[in-house]
């Protein structure tokens, strides 16, 4: 019996087609993805093949003006229209709190939404019960397939799930649910979830009875053969893991932003064992036409967005590199721009001894969600900025000891190379790392811009000195693992909305040209 698994993950509000780098579509003939194009390909496969499942591994929420305006209603509407069979909850599904998940998505979805390792407690338990499920048995052709969901247990650090949801260890939570499916005579089981590629592989290895793992969160691109676009494969598609009980378990992920449709064919024997698996992500480029009915619907929903944020704020004459490939690995000029805007927004010349009360900015690279292409006449709109900074956060003022900052910069690179969001972009700081050293001892130089000076210059960080720093509220609250900031901050004052800070700066400057200038080495 053959099953076709079509899968997406980390779509992040890319309902419309995008440029190749997943930013706003500029030249339509070269644009990719979007739900109208996705639907064309899905329908083509549904017509050609008998047993097809369309699955999403989480993080539909957050990323463009679509989410800013529609707050998840767009996700439910268009996923319903595409007839998704199931979705796993991602961390970003909690960005507007639990209510922001329940009202627009959980109540409106016509497909099961899954997570076995999220347990509700208190009054929320009844309110949310039955709206998301640990697993779902789906009829496919003449067979049944069990789908069991999971969500990153880091979600409380990454989003806003509140205090009444407990995020358990994925493997511990999944095993009893898979066992339950076995007792229901379900012998073909897919783990669908959002914890990143490393956890996906662990689930394949450790959870007895899981036949296939469909993942997300780490934006992992897997491909067999010559990749069709810019993404460099992290491994073959599917990635085969040998489980502890000796089975070959295929693990897949489909990059992000709706650029690819994961396409995996699995052959099962009559006892539900995987005999073979093969496939590849399908690049959703302009050779695939956009479905006219979905496109018309998109255009109808688009009207509200056009009124929202299309006026020009200013211009850029350089490419604003906000790609995760840059901002999570090295200094990126988008990070420099944002940090400069954050400092500029906090210029307060209240003391003759100080040129300003604050000179430093830190910004988690994972918080930068999109680049901006200068080739659109250099125009920057609120909409462009909403794709870069989609989380609706604030840029806050904190006071920290030098020793806390040192810990923060060690944390920034403690697992460097895995495209994780904690890599820090900076302003008013020069940092030098030696990545050949062991984690926790990689910061070899950390100089900070003086404030008590008439001519600003860089001096070595003093461990016992108290410094003012501008940073996202996400970091002030210990997000991305920066627990030391939350635990050790001496003062915290909330600031202005992130997009507003950057848009005000761009409007003030009129033309911007941020460079990569050696802040991080």
């Amino acid at each position: 019996w053959e099953l076709t698994i079509l899968h997406t993950n980390d779509v992040h509000s890319r309902l419309e087609q995008t440029s190749e780098d997943s930013s706003k579509c500029v030249n339509a003939s070269r644009c990719m993805g979007g739900v109208a194009r996705l639907f064309t390909k899905v329908q083509q496969i549904r017509r050609a093949e008998p047993n097809v499942l369309l699955l999403d591994a989480g993080d539909q929420y957050q990323g463009t003006i679509w989410f800013t305006v529609y707050k998840g209603a767009e996700v439910a509407h268009f996923m319903n229209a595409l007839r998704y069979d199931a979705m796993a909850l991602g961390n970003h599904e909690f960005d507007n709190g639990v209510e922001g998940l329940i009202e627009p998505l959980l109540k409106e979805a016509k497909f099961p939404i899954l997570s076995a390792n999220i347990k509700a407690k208190g009054p929320l338990a009844s309110q949310i019960s039955g709206l998301y499920l640990p697993y779902k048995v789906l009829p496919v052709g003449d067979e049944v397939v069990g789908i069991v969901g999971y969500t990153s247990k880091e979600t409380p650090f990454l989003s806003n799930p509140g205090t009444n949801l407990v995020f358990e260890d994925e493997i511990t939570a999944l095993q009893p649910e898979v066992d339950k499916l076995k007792t229901l005579n379900v012998n073909k089981i897919i783990a669908l979830g959002h914890s990143g590629f490393e956890m996906d592989k662990l689930i394949a290895q450790k959870v007895r009875g899981v036949d296939v793992v469909v993942g997300g969160h780490s934006n992992t691109f897997l491909y067999t053969g010559n990749p069709p676009s810019k993404e460099v494969p992290a491994g073959k598609y599917p990635f085969i893991v040998t489980s502890d009980d000796g089975r070959k378990v295929p693990v897949v992920q489909a990059y992000a932003f709706g650029k690819y449709l994961g396409y995996l064919k699995i052959e099962f024997d009559e006892r539900g064992n995987v005999i073979s698996s093969h496939g590849n992500p399908i690049l959703l480029n302009s050779s695939i036409p956009e479905d006219p009915s979905i496109k018309a619907d998109i255009n109808k929903w688009r009207i509200k967005l056009d009124n929202y944020s299309t006026q020009e704020l200013g211009k850029t004459i350089v490419y604003l590199d906000g790609s995760s490939q840059s901002c999570r690995f090295r200094e990126c000029n988008m990070g420099n721009l944002i940090c400069d805007a954050m400092i500029n927004n906090n210029l307060r010349h209240t003391d003759e001894m100080f040129w300003n009360h604050v000179s430093m900015c830190i910004l988690n690279g994972g918080g930068i969600r999109s680049p901006i292409d200068e080739r659109n006449n250099g125009t920057i709109t609120w909409e462009n900025l909403a794709a870069v900074l989609p989380f609706g956060g604030t840029f806050d003022l904190v006071q920290l000891k030098g020793s806390t900052l040192k810990k923060a910069f060690e944390h920034s690179v403690h697992r460097y190379g895995q495209s994780t969001g904690e890599f820090l972009q900076v302003g008013g700081i020069h940092v030098v790392y030696d990545l050949s050293r062991k984690p926790g001892d990689r910061v070899v130089k950390l100089d900070v811009l003086c404030t008590k000076c008439r001519v600003p210059s860089y001096d070595p960080l003093k461990m016992d000195e108290v410094y003012k720093v501008i940073l996202p509220n996400f970091l002030a609250n210990g997000g991305d693992g920066f627990q030391m900031i939350k635990d050790e901050l001496l003062r915290h004052d909330s600031g202005d909305q992130d997009i507003n800070v950057v848009s005000t700066y761009i409007s003030k400057m009129k033309v911007i040209y941020p460079a990569v200038e050696g802040r991080i080495k």
Partner: antibody, heavy 120, light 107 residues
Framework: EVQLVQSGAEVKKPGASVKVSCKAS????????MHWVKQAPGQGLEWIGY????????EYNQKFKDKATLTADTSASTAYMELSSLRSEDTAVYYC?????????????WGQGTTVTVSS | DIQMTQSPSSLSASVGDRVTITCRAS??????LNWLQQKPGGAIKRLIY???RLDSGVPSRFSGSRSGTEYTLTISSLQPEDFADYYC?????????FGGGTKVEIK
């Protein structure tokens, strides 16, 4: 299109038995459960139980445990409910309803109903 | 067993009226609730499942809501084809149980 076609009306004497059938089409019979529901004249609905035709697992409402026997023939895509030791209070319309395999969202399609009349 | 108390048992309304039917569960059933429609000929159709979710092909004038253990079916603008009996049904724990029904009649 999902269809559940039930057998025709039955008139039985007290003490007799009756077997009502429910023929499923338009979907894979073993991929869903089958529920049975009673509606006495002028009354509301009462759940009798369900069968999973894949595993043949059966769950009864305790009230009907000694009254109803649920079976299924997967080769014929047909579910059956046998009512034994009939009494006048068993006079009712009996419905079959397709159920969710794992019972998370239940009873989405219903048969047209079979009238069983118990009369001496 | 979980008791489902449905009210009103009958109501008279005109085409275009907004109609609400409520069901109260004797204990917590979360969102494990269906709303069913039974036409005069006896045919039964599920309208809403999981308290809020509309079945395919069901007009958007039907909606479900909840406050604690009280569940509401709302018909925003009653149409001629909506005159029927309506039942709530819980599937949170065995045995599944139904409300007593509400007959919606033409005024």
């Amino acid at each position: 299109e999902v269809q559940l076609v039930q057998s025709g009306a039955e008139v039985k004497k007290p003490g007799a038995s009756v077997k009502v059938s429910c023929k499923a089409s338009g979907y894979t019979f073993t991929s869903y459960t089958m529920h049975w529901v009673k509606q006495a004249p002028g009354q509301g609905l009462e759940w009798i139980g369900y069968i999973n035709p894949n595993s043949f697992y059966i769950e009864y409402n305790q009230k009907f445990k000694d009254k109803a026997t649920l079976t299924a023939d997967t080769s014929a895509s047909t579910a059956y409910m046998e009512l034994s030791s009939l009494r006048s209070e068993d006079t009712a319309v009996y419905y079959c309803a397709r159920g969710d395999y794992d019972l998370f969202y239940d009873m989405d399609n219903w048969g047209q109903g079979t009238t069983v009349t118990v009369s001496s | 067993d979980i008791q489902m108390t449905q009210s009103p048992s009958s109501l008279s309304a005109s085409v275009g009226d907004r109609v609400t039917i409520t069901c109260r569960a004797s204990q917590d059933i979360g969102n494990s609730l269906n709303w069913l429609q039974q036409k005069p000929g006896g045919a039964i159709k599920r309208l809403i499942y999981a308290t809020f979710r509309l079945d395919s092909g069901v007009p958007s004038r039907f909606s479900g809501s909840r406050s604690g253990t009280e569940y509401t079916l709302t018909i925003s603008s009653l149409q001629p084809e909506d005159f029927a009996d309506y039942y709530c049904q819980q599937y949170a724990s065995f045995p599944w149980t139904f409300g007593g029904g509400t007959k919606v009649e033409i005024k």
